[in-house]
């Protein structure tokens, strides 16, 4: 009663391993580390055999198969590249994921590495079998903005891609009869999320209540250069209009707002976000340099209708920028005091412009980014947004652009995104 | 087209309440605000309040808040409102609107002991 | 709450003549979001409801003849009636709905 002697299988082994086997004598085949027992197509850990009466063997011996981690998961903004020789996905083969740059970047400088486990799993050293994160990159166009030696610069053209997290804002309000229509600017802060005036998304009620627009009647451009032309400019509806809590639409204290985009949109040269500042109160130094764009900024008489309705001439049918020093607060204030009216420049709001005027972002739109360069992180960073200006025309003397300081609501910000902040380091100016 | 039919004509005594119906037909009732305005025989337009069938948002003039309720029901593209707390300085001829552009035919309501 | 004033509070016109009443509000209209000024005209006959004339201050409502115009902006509006004809007597309304809605107190256009 004595069974034919066992070869093992190759990249396996046999348990006991024995000279002869008699009958009810089993024997447990294994594989080697990186192989599975394959029985019938069926894969499995081990596989059990005995040494039946009539001295034949109860099943043959299963062969060795190499673990296969098979396809690799899509990484969202990422592509994967294979190390080893045709595209081999078995056992310690390695990929390597990285993200869609210059629009994207790995989340805490991952290497991306992931190695095929003995368990048929992609596996990464720090990260386990989860997938790294791509985060957009912010502050950093596709095309290098103007120096900011030079002091005046005044409606002038900005290229495509120069400002790639401006956004248009437009509202209607077709609750009202005749609908109601206007048009603000945003600025992009990842691919689901516009900032913006609180303003420009505030219903036109009947009293002071501070109510949201319906987010069914706000449509956000993003990409667009030329108003007249949006075919290749992306246009996306919200799926939720957040104003910040205290608002306060007699004097615009806390005039900051979000708009969370039905779906995200995909980044490159023309669509990318601005980063945040650090939480700082201070905001912007005076006598800073920043930038702002617009298409409101060449003609501030010109209505909504118009400047939406492609094919007529319209604002600034191309996207316009304006350059601007930060203004002392206490100067700003002290404009403001002397004129008749109740103007108040509060702590979350500061002022920008010149004193001899001429430039003026109330020739901006609202809720457009002032953007300064940080030039430790060398990313531009959004450190306000056009809120009000005063009485008199557009760039009168020593009438100055208030907007609202964004670094004094960061934590509200990341709050509304639902992203803690040591998530998103990379967006944040370092 | 765009209408909207009002309830008849009501007499109340003072200290009572009213309750005026205006049937929107020809348009998305939900999405479009009706206001409401009443004129006082021999006087000028007075408006009352103001409601959002969809949402049920509603913004009154600060004179009518606490008596005035406006309510809609969608389900029969009806908007109503209640005055209550009657005095004779309410009769009127209340109307409803759709925003601005179209009125209802008017209802007037008597208060007299 | 915005206080809107009309003048005259009557008018005696010939027929075929121009009639011109102004509105005056104690605050502007002038919605800098939307660019509009928030005035509409309303025409009132005897037993009938208000009819809108014109709104943002200058639109004229569909349907409604040529000869109405509005013009204005901010706090100082008026409507024309470039040749009065005899259906145009009537009471005429200025509303502002920049706020909560006021109306003016009425201009009354006759035959002279």
């Known amino acids: 009663n004595e069974c034919p002697e066992l070869q093992p299988p190759v990249h396996g082994k046999i348990e006991p391993s024995q000279a002869k086997y008699f009958f009810k004598d089993q024997v447990l085949v294994s594989c080697d580390t990186g192989y599975k027992v394959l029985k019938d197509n069926v894969e499995m850990d081990t596989f059990q055999i005995e040494c039946l009466k009539d001295g034949t063997w109860s099943n043959k011996i299963p062969t060795c198969k190499i673990v296969d981690c098979r396809a690799p998961g899509e990484l969202e903004h990422g592509l994967i590249t294979f190390s080893t020789r045709n595209n081999l996905t078995t056992y310690k083969s390695e990929i390597k994921y990285s993200c869609q740059e210059p629009y994207y970047k790995m989340l805490n400088n991952n290497t991306g590495i992931y190695t095929c486990s003995a368990q048929g799993v992609w596996m990464n050293k720090v990260l386990g079998r989860s997938l790294p994160t791509c985060l957009p990159e912010c502050g950093q166009p596709s095309r290098s903005l103007p120096s900011l030696v030079k002091r005046i610069i005044g409606g002038r053209n900005a290229e495509p891609g120069l400002f790639p997290w401006q956004a248009l804002i437009v509202v209607e309000d077709t609750s009202r009869v005749p609908n109601d229509k206007w048009f603000g600017s945003g600025a992009l802060l990842s691919a689901s999320w516009i900032l913006t005036a609180a303003h420009v998304l505030r219903s036109q009620r009947r009293d002071t209540t501070v109510i949201p627009v319906s987010k069914e009647h706000v449509t956000v451009y993003l990409g667009l250069h030329d108003v007249r032309d949006k075919s290749g400019a992306v246009n996306s509806s919200a799926a939720r209009v957040v104003l910040h809590p205290d608002f306060n639409i007699q004097n615009y204290n806390h005039d900051i707002a979000l708009v969370q985009l039905q779906e995200p949109v995909p980044l490159g040269p023309h669509v990318m976000p601005v980063c945040l500042p650090r939480l700082e109160p201070e905001g912007p130094a005076p006598h800073m340099l920043g930038l702002v764009a617009g298409w409101g900024i060449s003609n501030p008489n010109v209505t909504v209708d118009e400047i939406i309705s492609s094919g007529t001439r319209t604002l600034s049918d191309v996207l316009q920028y304006v350059k601007l020093p930060v203004v002392p607060h206490a100067e700003c204030k002290t404009s403001y005091e002397s004129r008749s009216g109740n103007y108040s420049v509060t702590e979350n709001m500061f002022c920008a412009g010149y004193y001899e005027g001429g430039k003026d972002t109330c020739l901006g739109d609202s809720g457009g980014a002032f953007v300064i360069f940080d030039d430790l992180s060398q990313r531009w960073v959004v450190q306000g947004l056009v809120s009000w200006g005063g009485p008199e025309e557009c760039g009168s003397k020593q009438v100055y652009g208030v907007y609202t300081k964004v670094s004094n609501y960061v934590d509200w910000v990341w709050e509304q995104m639902g992203l803690p902040q040591s998530v998103v380091e990379p967006q944040v100016e370092r | 087209q765009v209408q909207l039919v009002q309830s008849g004509a009501e007499v109340k005594k003072p200290g009572a309440s009213v309750k005026v119906s205006c049937k929107a037909s020809?348009?998305?009732?939900?999405?479009?605000?009706i206001e409401w305005v009443r004129q006082a025989p021999g006087q000028g337009l007075e408006w009352i309040g103001e409601?959002?069938?969809?949402?049920?948002?509603?913004n009154y003039n600060e004179k009518f808040k606490g008596r005035a309720t406006f309510t809609a029901d969608s389900s029969t593209s009806t908007a109503y409102m209640e005055l209550s707390s009657l005095r004779s300085e309410d009769t009127a001829v209340y109307y409803c609107?759709?925003?601005?552009?179209?009125w209802g035919q008017g209802t007037l309501v008597t208060v007299s002991s | 709450d915005i206080v809107m004033t009309q003048s005259p509070d009557s008018l005696a016109v010939s027929l075929g003549e121009r009639a011109t009443i102004n509105c005056k509000s104690s605050?502007?209209?002038?919605?800098?979001?939307?660019?509009?000024?928030?005035l509409a005209w309303y025409q009132q006959k005897p037993g009938q409801p208000p009819k809108l004339l014109i709104y943002?201050?200058?639109t004229r409502e569909s349907g409604v003849p040529d000869r109405f115009s509005g013009s204005g902006s901010g706090t100082d509006f008026t409507l024309t009636i470039s040749s009065l004809q005899a259906e145009d007597v009537a009471v005429y309304y200025c509303?502002?709905?920049?706020?909560?809605?006021?109306f003016g107190q009425g201009t009354k256009v006759e035959i002279k």
């Open positions: 609107l759709r925003s601005e552009d179209v």
């Open positions: 020809g348009y998305t009732f939900t999405g479009k605000w």
């Open positions: 409601i959002l069938p969809g949402t049920g948002s509603t």
């Open positions: 605050q502007s209209l002038l919605n800098s979001r939307t660019r509009k000024n928030y």
């Open positions: 943002w201050a200058s």
């Open positions: 509303k502002q709905s920049y706020n909560i809605p006021t």
